[in-house]
C-alpha cells in the first residue's frame, strides 16, 4: 500500500503568509509574488549574482515535530543559468545549500548559523536559460531529501545562498506513515514509518470480526518501511466456521449454506437430505432417517443404510455351496457397501440349530466382503444350512435395523474326495484321497472304481475303510481312469472327479516312480 504523507510545513499552500526569517535582514532572500497560469504564486527569491562572497540565509518558522521520526523535504525551485547574465557574472553560482536545526523551543528571530547542520547541496537538473526566462518558461526542479531520526520537539530548515539566482516556489516537509491496512482479513493500524532505512517496524495485525488465526498458523504481521510502504506480510487470518470471506470481511453463511471449519473456502450449499440451515451455520443437520458417518465430510449428502441384497442364490456342489447375490436396489446414497455372510446349521432329525462359523470354510473372510459371491466348503452331509447375507454401509452402525437376505440349502452328499497318485510301477498304481475331517465320521467305506482308458465295457471296484489303495495286476504303459467315492449309511457320497493315471513302461520298471 502507498505510504501516507503527513504534512508538517507547506510553503506553497500558505499563500505567502509564513513570514520566514531572512539573514542578513533586508538583503538576499526576498518574498515575491508572481503570476503563473493566471494564478498568483509566492516564492522566496535571491539573485545577487554580480557581487561575490554571498552568504544569504532563509530560515523557516519553527516546525513542531509531533510523532515524526524521519522527515522528508521536497523542494521545488528554479535556478537561472549564470551564462544568461552579462559577462557570465563571474561570482555567479547555480546551487544552494539546505540545512536543518533541531530545538525544543522556538528561538523566534534569534538566528544562529552554528546551530544548523548541512543536509545537502541542492543542484538543479535544469537551469533556466535566457530564452526560457524571456518566454516565462519556469524550469521547475524538484529535489527531495530526508533527515532522521529527529528527537527534539521541533526543527527549522534553512536555505543558504552563496551567489545563485534562485527562486524557491515550494517547500514541503512531511513524514510518512504506513496507512491503516486491511489485508488477509487482518487489520493493521496506521503506523509511523521508522527513521532508519535498513530497519522495518514489525506491526501485529488484529483479525477482523469472525476471523481467527488458523490452527498452527502464524499471527498476522506486517513490516512498515521507512517510505511508508507495508512490506513482508507474515501469517493470516481466516474466517471462522459459519463465516466466509466477502471482500475484506467475514460474512455469516446465508441460510441454506454452511461452513464447518476455519478455512479459505466459501460457504457451501447444504447437501442433499439435509434440513435447511439457519444463517451462520457450521453444519447442516440430516433429514430423519438419514445419517452422516463420522468420517463423512460435511459437504457430502446425508445417507442411509442400504436395502437388503437384491437376489441371493445358494448352489450346492457336494459338500460345498456357492452363494451369489446382487447389490441392494437402494445403496442409501453411498458407495462403501460391504457384505457379511453368516451360517446356521440344523440337524434334520432333531431340528436343533446352531451357528456353524467354526466348522465351515469360506473362500474369503465372510465379513467386509466387497464382491457379490463366496464359496462355503467343509459342509457336513445330510445337514440343513441357512446362509444370511447382510448388506452394510458407513451408516449402518447408526441404526439398529439390519438389511439382509437368507438362503437355505440341504447337504445330501459328502464332498468329493481329493485324489492323489502316490506311486506307480509297470503293473500297479498307488492312490490316496482325503475328505474334510467333519465328514469322515459319517463315512462307512470308500469305493475305488478304475478301468482302462478307452474300455467302456468293463471296470473294477475296490472297497476299503482307509484313505489309500494299491491297484495291482495292471497292464504296463497303460492309462487308467480312477474315481473315488465315499459310502455313508444314507448312501453314496459325491464321487471325485475321474483321474487319468498311467503305469510305467517296461524299460523304466527298475523302481517305483511317483
Amino acid at each position: 500500500a502507498q505510504g501516507k504523507e503527513v504534512v508538517l510545513l507547506d510553503f506553497a499552500a500558505a499563500g505567502g503568509e509564513l513570514g520566514w526569517l531572512t539573514h542578513p535582514y533586508g538583503k538576499g532572500w526576498d518574498l515575491m509574488q508572481n503570476i503563473m497560469n493566471d494564478m498568483p504564486i509566492y516564492m522566496y527569491s535571491v539573485c545577487n549574482v554580480m557581487s561575490g562572497d554571498q552568504d544569504n540565509w532563509l530560515r523557516t518558522n519553527w516546525v513542531y515535530r509531533g510523532e515524526a521520526e524521519r522527515i522528508f523535504i521536497e523542494l521545488k525551485f528554479t535556478v537561472r543559468d549564470c551564462n544568461s547574465f552579462p559577462g557570465g557574472a563571474s561570482s555567479c553560482k547555480e546551487t544552494f545549500n539546505l540545512y536543518y536545526a533541531e530545538s525544543d523551543l522556538d528561538y523566534g528571530t534569534n538566528f544562529q548559523k552554528r546551530l544548523f547542520t548541512k543536509i545537502d547541496t541542492i543542484a538543479p537538473d535544469e537551469i533556466t536559460v535566457s530564452s526560457d526566462f524571456e518566454a516565462r518558461h519556469v524550469k521547475l526542479n524538484v529535489e527531495e531529501r530526508s533527515v532522521g531520526p529527529l528527537t527534539r520537539k521541533g526543527f527549522y530548515l534553512a536555505f543558504q545562498d552563496i551567489g545563485a539566482c534562485v527562486a524557491l516556489l515550494s517547500v514541503r516537509v512531511y513524514y510518512k506513515k504506513c496507512p491503516e491496512l486491511l489485508q488477509s482479513l487482518a487489520r493493521f493500524p496506521e503506523t509511523i514509518a521508522g527513521s532508519d532505512a535498513p530497519s522495518l517496524a514489525t506491526v501485529a495485525g488484529t483479525c477482523v470480526d469472525h476471523a481467527v488465526v488458523p490452527p498452527g498458523g502464524e499471527e498476522p504481521r506486517m513490516h512498515c518501511a521507512v517510505d511508508g510502504e507495508w512490506l513482508v506480510p507474515i501469517g493470516q487470518c481466516l474466517c471462522q466456521a459459519g463465516y466466509e470471506k466477502v471482500e475484506d470481511a467475514c460474512q455469516a453463511c446465508s441460510p441454506g449454506f454452511f461452513k464447518f471449519e476455519v478455512s479459505e473456502s466459501p460457504c457451501l450449499e447444504c447437501p442433499e437430505h439435509t434440513l435447511p440451515s439457519p444463517e451462520g451455520a457450521t453444519s447442516c443437520e440430516c433429514e430423519e432417517g438419514f445419517f452422516r458417518a463420522p468420517q463423512d465430510p460435511m459437504s457430502m449428502p446425508c445417507t442411509r443404510p442400504p436395502s437388503a441384497p437384491h437376489y441371493l442364490t445358494a448352489v450346492g456342489m457336494g459338500a460345498k455351496v456357492e452363494l451369489r447375490w446382487t447389490p441392494p436396489q437402494d445403496s442409501g446414497g453411498r458407495e462403501d457397501i460391504v457384505y457379511s455372510v453368516t451360517c446356521e446349521q440344523c440337524w434334520p432329525e432333531s431340528g436343533e440349530c446352531g451357528p456353524c462359523e467354526s466348522s465351515v470354510r469360506y473362500s474369503e473372510p465372510p465379513h467386509g466382503l466387497t464382491r457379490t459371491s463366496v464359496t462355503v466348503s467343509d459342509l457336513e452331509p445330510h445337514m440343513n444350512y441357512t446362509f444370511t447375507v447382510e448388506a452394510r454401509n458407513g451408516v449402518s452402525g447408526l441404526v439398529t435395523s439390519r438389511s439382509f437376505r437368507t438362503a437355505s440349502v440341504s447337504i445330501n452328499q459328502t464332498e468329493p474326495p481329493k485324489v492323489r497318485l502316490e506311486g506307480r510301477s509297470t503293473t500297479s498304481l498307488s492312490v490316496s484321497w482325503s475328505i474334510p475331517p467333519p465328514q469322515q465320521s459319517r463315512v462307512w467305506k470308500y469305493e475305488v472304481t478304475y478301468r482302462k482308458k478307452g474300455d467302456s465295457n468293463s471296470y473294477n471296484v475296490r472297497r476299503t475303510e482307509g484313505f489309500s489303495v494299491t491297484l495291482d495286476d495292471l497292464a504296463p504303459d497303460t492309462t487308467y481312469l480312477v474315481q473315488v467315492q465315499a459310502l455313508t449309511q444314507e448312501g453314496q457320497g459325491a464321487g471325485s472327479k475321474v483321474h487319468e493315471f498311467q503305469t510305467l513302461s517296461p524299460e523304466g520298471s527298475g523302481s517305483l516312480a511317483v
Partner: antibody, heavy 128, light 107 residues
C-alpha cells in the same frame, strides 16, 4: 554603448498613417524585448506596444489595439511601429525602449517588463 | 487595468535633502515595480526595478522599497542633477501602466 534612434515622426492628418522606425546599435538587438512608449505634450508616460526578442509575442495598449502594428527586423537591428487610422489623441513623442533579461537580476521573470534603455524620441503630430 | 497613483505630484527640495516619493497600486503588484527619472526634453532613465533593485550605473543615494500596493522611492541626499520628474511603472500585468509623475523642483 546602447543606442536607440527613432525616426519617421511628423505631421499627419487624422485618419492618416505613419511608420516609425527605431535603429539599434551597441548591443545584441535579437536578445532584447523592444517596446514603444509615448508621451503626450505636458503629460505622463503611456506604454503603447511590445514585441519579444524573436518577433513574438506582441502586446498592445487598448487605446491603439487594431490600429497600430509593432514589428522588428533582427537582421537590420530595427524596430517598427505602423500607425494607421491616426487620431488627434495619438499626438505624442514616441520613444522606443528596450529590455534585456540579462540585466534583470531576478530568478523568475516578472509578469511583464520594465524598460532599461530608451531612445531620444520622435514627435508625431496628428492634426488637420 | 491597474491604476498607479503617485504622491505628491510635485515637491520642492534643497540639495542634500532626503526626498521620498510614494506610489500606490490599485491592486497588489508584489514587487513588480520600476522607477524612472525624466528631465525636460529627454528620454526617461531607469533607476530601480523590482521595487528595490538598483539598475546598473545608478547612484546609491537612490533606493526603493515596498511590496503589494505601497512603494516608495527615496533620494537620501538630493543632488543638483536629481531635479527632474520621477515616474513609477508596474509590470505585474501586460498593461504596464505608469504613475502620473512627481516633479522635484529646487526650493
Amino acid at each position: 554603448e546602447v543606442q536607440l534612434l527613432e525616426s519617421g515622426g511628423g505631421l499627419v492628418q487624422p485618419g492618416g498613417s505613419l511608420r516609425l522606425s527605431c535603429a539599434a546599435s551597441g548591443f545584441t538587438f535579437s536578445h532584447y524585448m523592444m517596446a514603444w512608449v509615448r508621451q503626450a505634450p505636458g503629460k505622463g508616460l503611456e506604454w503603447v506596444s511590445r514585441i519579444g526578442p524573436s518577433g513574438g509575442p506582441t502586446h498592445y495598449a487598448d487605446s491603439v489595439k487594431g490600429r497600430f502594428t509593432i514589428s522588428r527586423d533582427n537582421s537590420k537591428n530595427t524596430l517598427y511601429l505602423q500607425m494607421n487610422s491616426l487620431r488627434a489623441e495619438d499626438t505624442a513623442v514616441y520613444y522606443c525602449a528596450g529590455y534585456d533579461s540579462g540585466y534583470d537580476y531576478v530568478a523568475v521573470a516578472g509578469p511583464a517588463e520594465y524598460f532599461q534603455h530608451w531612445g531620444q524620441g520622435t514627435l508625431v503630430t496628428v492634426s488637420s | 487595468d491597474i491604476q498607479m497613483t503617485q504622491s505628491p505630484s510635485s515637491l520642492s527640495a534643497s540639495v542634500g535633502d532626503r526626498v521620498t516619493i510614494t506610489c500606490r497600486a490599485s491592486q497588489s503588484i508584489s514587487t513588480w515595480l520600476a522607477w524612472y527619472q525624466q528631465k525636460p526634453g529627454k528620454a526617461p532613465k531607469l533607476l530601480i526595478y523590482k521595487a528595490s533593485n538598483l539598475h546598473t550605473g545608478v547612484p546609491s543615494r537612490f533606493s526603493g522599497s515596498g511590496s503589494g500596493t505601497e512603494f516608495t522611492l527615496t533620494i537620501s541626499g538630493l543632488q543638483p542633477d536629481d531635479f527632474a520628474t520621477y515616474y513609477c511603472q508596474q509590470y505585474n500585468s501586460y498593461s504596464r501602466t505608469f504613475g502620473q509623475g512627481t516633479k522635484v523642483e529646487i526650493k
